[in-house]
Interface confidence: low
């Protein structure tokens, strides 16, 4: 029943032509491509990616021709090598084309950048869009995946493949359509917001692999999967999750054209054994190979079997517990974390993890001790305040959220963060701290048996952005720590942050307050960025204000900002206003 | 190629005041932390301080706190090490060093610049 | 003062094989091993030989090794010859500020 035990292939370059056709072999070429040269213009890629396919296409007609055994990685690697541009563009990613695989292609893999220095996308007229995608439909789609892909380097391309299917359809029905506009920018905002939510969690199973390696993923994987389909056997998971980890590894690993096949033929298996794992799968495996794919990703838990034993007898109270666990340690706590996972679908993976890492670390302990069974007998009693913990944290920020808004509710956060990791740039604080504030109105109106899935498994995505944004410029050791020593506590490492008393106050520069009537311009959105930017920046500079003081500020703020975007001279408003708004500000906050 | 030139060696009286620059060239120069180094005559290296030309964030180890102001102009690709009182102890080699994040390595330098301090 | 101790002076014969310690690594540098060693020649600006406790740029000869053990970095190199005649410094994350220290620097002598 393995899925991926294939035959030894002549050509890996043909076999992969020929499983995943011409489109998505040069779609996929495409991502992988515009995600390792990030910066490379948009012909350069196109121009690459036709020598490949016409490549491929040559060793699909003979798998003998010269260098059609070469695997993809060196194919790939040498077309990326030959960018004229690529020292001066890249500097010392350039170095990487002195190595051998596999050495190249993990230095290609390391100089991924999570936030390249490219322009923000910025949305042309609905006209100006229509008139490019009837001019040239293949082109604008590829142009799509190029965007997408170089600023998003890990995401999910098999995923992205469903996006652009999307994106396309969109563009099909409503150029067309009498208000055209009408019917294709909430197509485009779902699309735009689906893909960052998507970039995001697949960056975090990413980081999962690479930081914390195929151990760490498989745990999550096992205790996602017994929550989705508690119905299904343990051996049957486990076959899940070793594949979904292989998958994975794949995409992560810039190995597109594998992950893509792989994953086509993981979902074309849950489906043909869909009895044996869940009953929510049949209309998922209704529908085309892309839209099936997704579907099974996003299918929603399985009813739990009734009458599942209690926990206690196979994992307490059995006499054979430290012999299960000294034969096989791994499979032991995969049972255990299975048996938990799928009786638990309230509970977060995250939290999951905390409580089959704290039965590991019993297990550990007392399996050495004279008398093992009576020092992991109350082992259940330790898992108590882990699950209270989040509980109550959800309860509470949900109540705030509730009473504040979804505005106010980040500018708390903000506040909050700031204090904790007063170092962090102003804009990654604003970017996570805004996604961070989401999380109320994504999760809170859920019921409680959902809230905490839903909260705690979001916040980790979120704090992983957090995470890699700081890695590639470390300005704080508490977020180095919180970051790299646990990924399940991650959450509760930041929570459990206090305002950083070592922080020196950054010294008072008033430019940094100063604003200019093209803030009346800007939409909602961006007007409350500029907002909670001056925020983050006054934290900094006075961190021991008041909410108090904080807030009249603020107040004070919006008061200036309207009053000036209604004068007939804006700018003067602003540059007098401003001024007295600074000093005003500056005394408030005895600076 | 990534290169960092230092401007020229300084003779000064104790009291004056002094600004020495590095410029980068070969790299995004706002993408990576500058640090300053002194080496005194005969002594080992210290690091004074950092700073990120993208944002200007500057940390000092506590010994330079205050000493030494560290700045950057992107616009020009430079930072600069810059004294408003010098000491004869002041006296020294300065280099500038490219590093990877802030408390990782330093692995392209200049080439000095010899800072004497006398009456 | 130096947070980081490094012995004042090494020494070898060609062909030999000499070690110089590092010791007084904070734990948070030692858990995300944040040491790098550098090699200075009279009159020269330093050069980067190991980061991140064992990593070697690239150009530097495979006869540099680095490894920690508890709160001690330590730098050997093999096969010795007569151009690795130089300081040899140690540099470490210090937590404070974010800046890095250095140790006091070694000198090391092929006899």
């Known amino acids: 029943r393995g899925v991926f035990r294939r035959d030894a292939h002549k050509s890996e370059v043909a076999h992969r032509f020929k499983d995943l056709g011409e489109e998505n072999f040069k779609a996929l070429v495409l991502i992988a491509f515009a995600q390792y040269l990030q910066q490379c213009p948009f012909e350069d890629h196109v121009k690459l990616v036709n020598e490949v396919t016409e490549f491929a296409k040559t060793c699909v007609a003979d798998e003998s021709a010269e260098n059609c055994d070469k695997s993809l990685h060196t194919l790939f690697g040498d077309k990326l090598c030959t960018v004229a541009t690529l020292r001066e563009t890249y500097g010392e990613m350039a170095d990487c084309c002195a190595k051998q695989e596999p050495e190249r292609n993990e230095c290609f893999l390391q100089h991924k950048d999570d936030n390249p220095n490219l322009p923000r996308l910025v949305r042309p007229e609905v006209d100006v869009m229509c008139t490019a995608f009837h001019d040239n439909e293949e082109t604008f789609l590829k142009k799509y995946l190029y965007e997408i892909a170089r600023r998003h380097p890990y995401f999910y391309a098999p995923e992205l493949l469903f996006f652009a299917k999307r994106y396309k359809a969109a563009f099909t029905e409503c150029c067309q359509a009498a208000d055209k506009a009408a019917c294709l920018l909430p197509k485009l905002d779902e699309l735009r917001d689906e893909g960052k939510a998507s970039s995001a969690k697949q960056r975090l199973k990413c980081a999962s692999l690479q930081k914390f390696g195929e151990r760490a993923f498989k745990a999550w994987a096992v205790a996602r999967l017994s929550q989705r389909f508690p119905k299904a056997e343990f051996a049957e998971v486990s076959k899940l999750v070793t594949d979904l980890t292989k998958v994975h590894t794949e995409c992560c690993h810039g190995d597109l054209l594998e992950c893509a096949d792989d994953r086509a033929d993981l979902a074309k298996y849950i489906c043909e054994n869909q009895d044996s794992i869940s009953s929510k799968l049949k209309e998922c495996c209704e529908k085309p190979l892309l839209e099936k794919s997704h579907c099974i990703a996003e299918v929603e838990n399985d009813e739990m079997p009734a009458d599942l034993p209690s926990l206690a007898a196979d994992f307490v109270e059995s006499k054979d517990v430290c012999k299960n666990y000294a034969e096989a340690k791994d499979v032991f706590l995969g049972m255990f974390l299975y048996e938990y996972a799928r009786r638990h679908p309230d509970y977060s993976v995250v939290l999951l993890l905390r409580l089959a890492k704290t039965y590991e670390t019993t297990l550990e302990k007392c399996c050495a001790a004279a008398d093992p069974h009576e020092c992991y007998a109350k082992v259940f009693d330790e898992f108590k305040p882990l699950v209270e913990e989040p509980q109550n944290l959800i309860k509470q920020n949900c109540e705030l959220f509730e009473q504040l808004g979804e505005y106010k509710f980040q500018n708390a956060l903000l506040v909050r963060y700031t204090k904790k990791v007063p170092q962090v740039s102003t804009p990654t604080l604003v970017e996570v701290s805004r996604n961070l504030g989401k999380v109320g109105s994504k999760c809170c109106k859920h019921p409680e048996a959902k809230r905490m899935p839903c909260a705690e498994d979001y916040l980790s995505v979120v704090l992983n952005q957090l995470c890699v944004l700081h890695e590639k410029t470390p300005v704080s050791d508490r977020v180095t720590k919180c970051c790299t020593e646990s990924l399940v506590n991650r959450r509760p490492c930041f929570s459990a942050l206090e305002v950083d008393e070592t922080y020196v106050p950054k010294e008072f520069n008033a430019e940094t307050f100063t604003f200019h009537a093209d803030i009346c311009t800007l939409s909602e959105k961006e007007r409350q960025i500029k907002k909670q930017t001056a925020l983050v920046e006054l934290v900094k500079h006075k961190p021991k204000a008041t909410k108090e003081q904080l807030k009249a500020v603020m107040d004070d703020f919006a008061a200036f900002v309207e009053k000036c975007c209604k004068a007939d001279d804006k700018e003067t408003c602003f540059a007098e206003e401003g001024k007295k708004l600074v000093a005003a500000s500056q005394a408030a906050l005895g600076l | 190629e990534v290169q960092l030139v230092q401007s020229g060696a300084e003779v000064k009286k104790p009291g004056e005041s002094l600004k020495i620059s590095c410029k980068g060239s070969g790299y995004s120069f706002t993408n990576y932390w500058i640090g300053w180094v002194r080496q005194m005559p005969g002594e080992g290296l210290e690091w004074m301080g950092i700073i990120y030309p993208g944002d200007s964030d500057t940390r000092y180890s506590p010994s330079f706190e205050g000493q030494v102001t560290i700045s950057a102009d992107k616009s020009i690709s430079t930072a600069y090490l810059q004294w408003n009182s010098l000491k004869a102890s002041d006296t020294a080699m300065y280099y500038c060093?490219?590093?990877?994040?802030?408390?990782?390595?330093?692995?392209?330098w200049g080439q000095g610049t010899l800072v004497t301090v006398s009456s | 003062q130096s947070a980081l101790t490094q012995p004042a002076s090494v020494s070898g014969s060609p062909g030999q094989s000499i070690t110089i310690s590092c010791s007084g690594i904070?734990?948070?540098?030692?858990?995300?091993?944040?040491v790098s060693w550098y090699q200075q020649y009279p009159g020269k600006a330093p050069k980067l030989i190991i980061y991140e406790v064992t990593k070697r740029p690239s150009g530097v000869s495979n006869r540099f090794s680095g490894s920690k053990s508890g709160n001690t970095a330590s730098l050997t190199i093999s096969g010795l010859q007569a151009d690795d005649e130089a300081e040899y410094s140690c540099s470490s994350y210090a937590g404070r500020n974010a800046v890095a220290v250095f140790g006091g620097g070694t000198q090391l002598t092929v006899l």
């Open positions: 904070s734990s948070l540098a030692g858990s995300y091993n944040l």
């Open positions: 060093a490219r590093l990877h994040g802030v408390v990782s390595r330093g692995d392209y």
